[in-house]
């Protein structure tokens, strides 16, 4: 079974900078999985943001600002990255990655 690890416990950025969050997949080939990213703002329900499927297809939640989030995967390091552009107050949250095995 696949296992996920988010090595960064926290990431501190100044306004308008870029944050990159990592999710390391083990126990399964990342190319054979879909990785989903979610965020949980304080006091709010968890929200789906973006996913990258086994074939590389990216799906973004409607209503998420255009260009705010970018998802990628690096098979060599078995890692999925979530890039948050122009960090703002509204981006303060806990971000989770999740796995769906094909």
């Amino acid at each position: 079974a696949g296992h996920l690890e988010q090595p960064q416990i926290s990431s501190t950025k100044t306004l308008s900078k870029t944050a990159r969050l990592e999710c390391v997949v083990s126990g399964i080939t990342i190319s054979a999985t879909s990785v989903y990213w979610y965020r949980e703002r304080p006091g709010e329900v968890i929200q789906f943001l973006v996913s990258i499927s086994y074939d590389g297809t990216v799906r973004k939640e409607s209503g998420i600002p255009s260009g705010k989030f970018e998802v990628d995967r690096i098979p060599e390091t078995s890692t999925s990255t979530l890039t948050i552009h122009n960090v703002e107050k509204q981006d303060i949250a806990t971000y989770y990655c999740a796995l769906w095995e094909v």
């Epitope: 306004l15 304080p42 600002p65 122009n86 703002e88 303060i92």
Partner: antibody
């Protein structure tokens, strides 16, 4: 002293348009979320719209959604409110207001700490 | 949408008296997201309290805020002549709308 100065108000006929401006001085606008708040004659405060520091997150009150557009030009240290399809009920004093910002890991609200003096919009035939 | 209801609508008091203003939310509001403002005739509002209980810069210590959940209170311990004004509570979160209460007018008795 940090300051916000609104302009662009005036008398307009129903269905008309106006563009309000808000100029910031002695602080860097790009570091703050900004808001428009209005107050109809003899009434209370009504939040109208907000825009995040990098313009990614934009919100409107239901009463103005689809008619008003908030924007900002951080290079010019200015905030704008484009108002279209104006109605009599849009008559109010319009204030721009600065959201004091955030720090740390908590989404913490510090209030609207700097307000402009207001600009009056009157919609009447 | 969270609705904030302020009471009383008008508070008639004399200088030196204690004023207690109430703000009740239709659903629970994080105390981190509750602010109070003062507005005098012909002037823009002024931030008094943020985070339900923290005084904004330059606000005298006779103003204090308290409460959590759905019930919040602004207290003015001893009214000064310049405190007679309209007071608004406001809730704010990471999603809109960022509503204000309808206001409480503190007038001279």
């Amino acid at each position: 002293e940090v300051q916000l100065v609104e302009s662009g108000g005036g008398l307009v006929k129903p269905g008309g348009s106006l563009r309000l401006s808000c100029a910031a001085s002695r602080f860097t606008l790009s570091s703050y979320d900004m808001n428009w708040v209005r107050q109809a004659p003899g009434k209370g405060l009504e939040w109208v719209s907000s825009i995040s520091s990098s313009s990614s997150y934009i919100y409107y009150a239901d009463s103005v959604k689809g008619r008003f557009t908030i924007s900002r030009d951080n290079a010019k240290n200015s905030l704008y409110l484009q108002m279209n399809s104006l109605r009599a009920e849009d008559t109010a004093v319009y204030y721009c207001a600065r959201d004091r910002g955030v720090g740390g890991t908590d989404y913490y609200y510090y209030g609207l700490d700097v307000w402009g003096q207001g600009t009056t919009v009157t919609v009447s035939s | 949408e969270i609705v904030l209801t302020q009471s009383p609508g008008t508070l008639s008091l004399s200088p030196g008296e204690r004023a207690t203003l109430s703000c009740r939310a239709s659903q629970s509001v994080s105390s981190s997201y509750l602010a109070w403002y003062q507005q005098k005739p012909g002037q823009a509002p002024r931030l008094l309290i943020y985070g339900a209980s923290s005084r904004a810069t330059g606000i005298p210590d006779r103003f204090s805020g308290s409460g959590s959940g759905t019930d919040f209170t602004l207290t003015i311990s001893r009214l000064e002549p310049e405190d007679f004004a309209v007071y608004y509570c406001q809730q704010y979160g990471s999603s809109p709308p960022y509503t204000f209460g309808q206001g409480t007018k503190v007038e001279i008795k």
